[in-house]
């Protein structure tokens, strides 16, 4: 055993427009907010009722965001990748790793 | 699960001060971004102001731009409401409410919908 836990994951392409109330999830992470152990990468955390990630129902709670239209997460602040996704415009396109 | 408690809800004249207080249990406080709302007599709970896990993002509802402020200090699990220049449409219960991670969306949009810890509330009273 080297004790790490290794995990099955897949990416996928969401394509979501922003609803009413925005995009409708929320996120933790970044350099300055690791949330999962040796991770700054940019997790959800949960996902608003009736928002527009949940009527779409590919994005999951626990899944990793790689890149926000095509602009990587990677070593970001929390707060500049909350201002990225809430600057994304209407149309929306997520990079993200699923756990399986 | 993070449990809330306010404090600091009194009865003020017109055009005082009162702040709020609310103690918040976890270990991870700094993940949660904090709010507070308002819920008049007869009326739906309203949000009043909210402020990110590390305390860098603020929002407010407009009728509270420029007499209230959110603060929070993390080390202390706390998260504070001074309220100035009280107007008796103020008066209301005061909740104060958690939710894990940052939304996405800008608290234009903000409801009590996007939290999911609440506290029990402090009633504010502003007489004329």
């Known amino acids: 055993m080297n004790g790490r836990v290794d995990y099955l994951v897949t990416e996928e392409e969401i394509n979501l427009t922003r609803g009413p109330s925005g995009l409708g999830f929320n996120i933790v992470g970044g350099t300055d907010q690791q949330y999962v152990s040796n991770d700054s990468g940019i997790y959800v955390s949960r996902i608003k009722e009736n928002g527009a990630a949940a009527l779409d129902g590919r994005l999951q709670e626990g899944d990793k965001i790689l890149s926000v239209n095509g602009q990587d997460l990677k070593n970001l602040l929390h707060q500049d990748a909350v201002d990225l996704f809430r600057n994304a415009g209407y149309a929306v396109s997520l990079r993200v790793q699923h756990r399986l | 699960d993070v449990q809330l408690v306010e404090s600091g809800g009194g009865l003020v004249q017109a055009g005082g001060s009162l702040r709020l207080s609310c103690a918040a249990s976890?270990?991870?406080?700094?993940?949660?971004?904090m709010g507070w709302f308002h819920q008049a007599p007869g009326k739906e709970r309203e949000f009043v102001a909210e402020i990110s896990g590390t305390g860098g993002n603020t929002g407010y509802a407009d009728s509270v731009k420029g007499r209230f402020t959110i603060s929070r200090d993390n080390a202390k699990n706390t998260v504070y409401l001074q309220m100035n220049s009280l107007k008796p449409e103020d008066t209301a219960v005061y909740y104060c409410a958690a939710v894990i991670g940052s939304p996405t969306d800008s608290s234009d949009y903000r409801s009590s919908l996007d939290y999911d810890y609440w506290g029990q509330g402090t009633q504010v009273t502003v007489s004329e």
């Open positions: 976890g270990h991870t406080f700094s993940s949660y971004t």
